[in-house]
């Protein structure tokens, strides 16, 4: 766009002798600038297209030469389960809901000490339009929340089988499942055990070797022949989910303050929020940097607190 600027200056120079430029000349100059602008925009568009094409053209597939690596040690797993399972864990913290009643506001400061200061001052006079309103600052009384770890283990030895038809007696179906899932032609392998639940039409198949489950799971279905009818059962990964470190916590928010005493105000909530924000931004009012303000002048609102 620098070029654009230079061209404009050039045109201005050509048409700007020291003498006074008349209206006609002025109009002509604007027209010329507009034309030049359109021309430049087209040129930019063309160059951008070319650039995109060039980018595609210059994307290269490089065969990186083989690197010789020196293995210093072999990590021996403590037990077989490290090989037979894929583990992952998730930390889950619930958000704690708080209902802001009519005439209340929540203000969150960037710093804890500012929030504490605002609470300790308790009474604050906030100018809202032509009203000098006295609001009370209190800590936010929060309900209890929960925090826990979800520990997921995906087995490399087991699979879930569902949609098993109820066409055989339990012992026979167990044998039939083992027989079918041991067929290498279908990606199966030696079966260690079959846990079959006739009622739910599901089973857990445990294989002897690692890798068989992965092979079977490449397809979502598996053939199960019973008296010449091919039933297609559904296969899915076998996962075990454990809940760990379940904690219930409660307390008060360190950076958020509850403001009460705004019941009589009939104004737009956003305007009031801005005014509260402005008031509490000022150090002379005992405030500091504000993160967010949420005000309820009509219907109660739900605010969610998280760690």
């Amino acid at each position: 766009m620098e070029a654009d600027k230079d061209d404009t200056q050039q045109i201005l120079k050509e048409h700007s002798p020291d003498e006074f430029i008349k209206d006609e000349q002025n109009k002509g100059l604007i027209d010329e600038i507009t034309k030049k602008n359109i021309q430049l925009k087209k040129e930019i568009q063309k160059l951008e297209t070319e650039l995109q094409e060039a980018t595609k053209e210059f994307q290269i597939k490089e065969d990186i030469p083989e690197t010789k690596m020196k293995f210093l040690s072999v990590e021996t797993p403590e037990n077989d389960s490290q090989l037979s399972n894929i583990s992952c864990s998730f930390q889950v913290s619930s958000k704690v809901p708080y209902e802001i009643q009519k005439g209340q506001a929540l203000i969150t400061f960037e710093k804890e000490e500012v929030a504490q200061n605002v609470v300790s001052m308790s009474k604050h006079h906030v100018q809202i339009k032509d009203v000098n309103l006295e609001v009370t600052a209190k800590p936010v009384p929060l309900n209890s929340g929960v925090r826990f770890q979800v520990y997921v283990e995906v087995s490399k030895m087991k699979i879930n089988v569902t949609e098993i038809p109820d066409t055989l007696r339990e012992d026979q179906m167990r044998d039939k499942l083992e027989l079918s899932f041991s067929k290498s032609r279908n990606g199966g392998g030696e079966v260690d055990r079959v846990d079959y639940d006739r009622q739910s039409g599901s089973a857990v198949i445990t294989f002897v070797e690692i890798g068989v489950a992965d092979k079977i799971l490449k397809k979502k279905e598996y053939p199960l022949y019973i008296n010449q009818t091919c039933h297609r059962v559904t296969v899915s990964p076998y996962t075990e989910i454990h809940l760990k470190k379940y904690q219930i916590f409660s307390g008060t928010s360190k950076r958020t303050v509850l403001l009460t005493g705004m019941e009589g105000i009939q104004m737009d909530e956003e305007i009031v929020e801005d005014l509260i924000n402005i008031h509490f931004q000022r150090a002379k009012n005992g405030g500091g940097e504000v993160d967010v303000v949420k005000c309820s002048l009509g219907q109660p609102h739900i605010a969610y607190f998280e760690e």
Partner: antibody, heavy 124, light 112 residues
Framework: QSLEESGGDLVKPGASLTLTCTAS?????????MCWVRQAPGKGLEWIAC????????TYEASWAKGRFTISKTSSTTVTLQMTSLTAADTATYFC?????????????????WGPGTLVTVSS | ALVMTQTPSSVSAAVGGTVTINCQAS??????LAWYQQKPGQPPKLLIY???NLESGVPSRFKGSGSGTEYTLTISDLECDDAATYYC??????????????FGGGTEVVVK
């Protein structure tokens, strides 16, 4: 691959006897049932019992054999048949046979491997 | 219980001829039928499984057919070596009963 029966003998009525079938060249797996079939002199084949060679070891007996004949898997290459309260009608050649599953495209079975048989004679 | 009825009990034919053995099941066996050949003093030998599939090494002169409850074994171009007793057999999975297994009564084939 072969099967061999042992334990056949001449016993008195009311006696018990255990027959053993030993597999060579293969070990039991999920693809078959190991079975016992008998044949009385000059008569036809009669199915006695089968045991699934897979992990469950499910057993199936002919209705007439229930309670008197028990099939069991004693190792990955041996199957036994325990017979009690034997009578003259139980005199026969007892075959051990492998019932194989041809179920790649269907639910087909066949006794594709047999032992030579062992003779059991029940006589006073 | 599963019952297999085999007919005839005996059949004779000349070398080069054809014999047909029938087998009837007491219930639908869904083509899960096998045929065996047994010679005196020997264990049976599997010829056909799944009603019509030839076991490896078995000559194509042996042909199985049928479905439902009716099955047939046809031996064509009879040879002296085909003289034996032939048995049909089926095993069946069930929803209500034990897995059943049964043999037919046998058919003696005499080659003249």
């Amino acid at each position: 691959q072969s099967l061999e029966e042992s334990g056949g003998d001449l016993v008195k009525p009311g006696a018990s006897l255990t027959l053993t079938c030993t597999a060579s060249g293969f070990s039991f797996s999920s693809s078959y049932y190991m079975c016992w079939v008998r044949q009385a002199p000059g008569k036809g084949l009669e199915w006695i019992a089968c045991i699934y060679a897979g992990s469950s070891g499910s057993t199936y007996e002919a209705s007439w054999a229930k309670g008197r004949f028990t099939i069991s898997k004693t190792s990955s290459t041996t199957v036994t048949l325990q017979m009690t309260s034997l009578t003259a009608a139980d005199t026969a050649t007892y075959f051990c046979a492998r019932e194989y599953s041809y179920d790649d495209y269907g639910d087909f079975w066949g006794f594709n491997l047999w032992g030579p048989g062992t003779l059991v004679t029940v006589s006073s | 219980a599963l019952v297999m009825t085999q007919t005839p009990s005996s059949v004779s034919a000349a070398v080069g001829g054809t014999v047909t053995i029938n087998c009837q099941a007491s219930q639908n066996i869904y083509t899960n039928l096998a045929w065996y050949q047994q010679k005196p003093g020997q264990p049976p030998k599997l010829l056909i499984y799944g009603a019509s599939n030839l076991e490896s090494g078995v000559p194509s002169r042996f042909k199985g057919s049928g479905s439902g409850t009716e099955y047939t074994l046809t031996i064509s171009d009879l040879e002296c070596d085909d003289a034996a007793t032939y048995y049909c057999q089926s095993s069946l999975y069930s929803r209500i009963a034990d897995r059943a297994n049964a043999f037919g009564g046998g058919t003696e084939v005499v080659v003249k």
